[in-house]
Interface confidence: low
């Protein structure tokens, strides 16, 4: 069963997805999307990475953290009572049926306090730089086919209930994460 | 090869307007951000204003706020600084250089040739 | 907005030294602190990102630190190309912000 996580109407949603890469800088392709995660893929696709960077994202949706290092943890900015549902993060593991699937539930509740509208085209009022709070990965990478063995040592998600993704980082940091496997 | 242009620049009157324009090639500026730096003569850097054209996100120096507008044409894979208002401290050389990654905060890790703007009567 | 005090202002150095220039922030960047080198007429170019993490391509001679708000570039062994203005550039909040930069000129 999926893992829930709220946020407010207005406020930033956090998902998290995590991965070790088998080495620095060798990326496994990611792919997060709206709904369950079928068998093959990801459907209704949001976000994807590839094995150097994010070559496919749409509006308010981000990867916060450092996706260099295998955080791939989603940020919905600005969320809606439409933005509810399940949403997939899968972590695309090369050879048949290797993938890590997480269905991470959304449950967004209304505001408290009605919040004073988003400027959608100012960065800084939609979602603030202040939010980064860690360095990025190895300068270079490697395609995936050089490594004719990919040893994923984590994979692992956050259980918490968080929003901020500086509480997430620093909770990371300090071994707050499932081991899954 | 990565490789960022600008052009646009020149001499212009307090007051007037000026576009630059920063072309980028071999990157697609939807999975970046690009800034603006300017660099007055015998100065230091001076970020400007910066641009996530995926999702329209934009970010200005409050010296330049309301008078600059950064923006994007992701088909001709350039950003543009529309300057109006000039003044004379804004001489300087621009530079475009583009984010380490997608996110709107980060390192530059590709840098234009810079243009030169005058501000002058 | 976040001030990055950078020093010195400049320096004098052989080739063969050791070079060491600091920036401190006047708040909490955690690690997101780039490093430029810019010689004259030229763009700067990217040395050093996320504190101590090395740029692609970028001579081994070059290191990044940190210690709290205060971030260390060092130059292990001066070559006649690494002479230059340096800059430091915080980049964890808006507006980013760079030092002032260090030039380092020959002794």
């Known amino acids: 069963s999926e893992v829930e996580y709220r946020a407010e109407v207005g406020q930033n949603a956090y998902l998290p997805c995590f991965y070790t890469p088998a080495a620095p800088g060798n990326l496994v392709p990611v792919c997060w999307g709206k709904g369950a995660c079928p068998v093959f893929e990801c459907g209704n696709v949001v976000l994807r990475t590839d094995e150097r960077d994010v070559n496919y994202w749409t509006s308010r949706y981000w990867l916060n953290g450092d996706f260099r290092k295998g955080d791939v943890s989603l940020t919905i900015e600005n969320v809606t009572l439409a933005d509810s549902g399940i949403y997939c993060c899968r972590i695309q593991i090369p050879g048949i049926m290797n993938d890590e699937k997480f269905n991470l539930k959304l449950v967004i509740k209304p505001a408290k306090v009605t919040p004073a509208p988003t400027r959608q085209r100012d960065f800084t009022a939609a979602f603030p730089r202040m939010l980064t709070t860690r360095g990025h990965g190895p300068a270079e990478t490697q395609t995936l086919g050089s490594l004719p063995d990919i040893n994923l040592t984590q994979i692992s998600t956050l259980a918490n209930e968080l929003r901020d993704s500086r509480l997430a980082n620093d909770l990371r940091d300090s071994g707050a994460t499932i081991r899954i496997g | 090869e990565v490789q960022l242009v600008e052009s646009g620049g020149g001499l212009v009157q307090p007051g007037g307007s000026l576009r630059l324009s920063c072309a980028a090639s071999g990157f697609n500026i939807r999975n970046h951000a690009i800034h603006w730096v300017r660099q007055a003569p015998g100065k230091g850097l001076e970020w400007v204003a910066d641009i996530a054209p995926a999702g329209g996100y934009t970010d200005y120096a409050d010296s330049v706020k309301d008078r600059f507008t950064i923006s994007a044409d992701t088909s001709k894979n350039t950003a543009y600084l529309q300057m109006n208002s000039l003044r004379a401290e804004d001489t300087a050389v621009y530079y475009c250089a583009r984010g380490y990654v997608y996110r709107m905060w980060d390192s530059y890790d590709y840098w234009g040739q810079g243009t030169l703007v005058t501000v002058s009567s | 907005d976040i001030q990055m005090t950078q020093s010195p202002s400049s320096l004098s150095a052989s080739v063969g030294d050791r070079v060491t220039i600091t920036c401190r922030a006047s708040q909490d960047v955690n690690t997101a602190v780039a490093w430029y080198q810019q010689k004259p007429g030229k763009a700067p170019k990217l040395l050093i990102y996320?504190?101590?993490f090395l740029y692609s391509g970028v001579p081994s001679r070059f290191s990044g630190s940190r210690s709290g708000t205060d971030f260390t570039l060092t130059i292990s062994s001066l070559q006649p190309e690494d002479f230059a203005t340096y800059y430091c550039q915080q980049h964890y909040t808006t507006p980013p912000t760079f030092g002032q930069g260090t030039k380092v000129e020959i002794k």
């Open positions: 996320s504190a101590s």
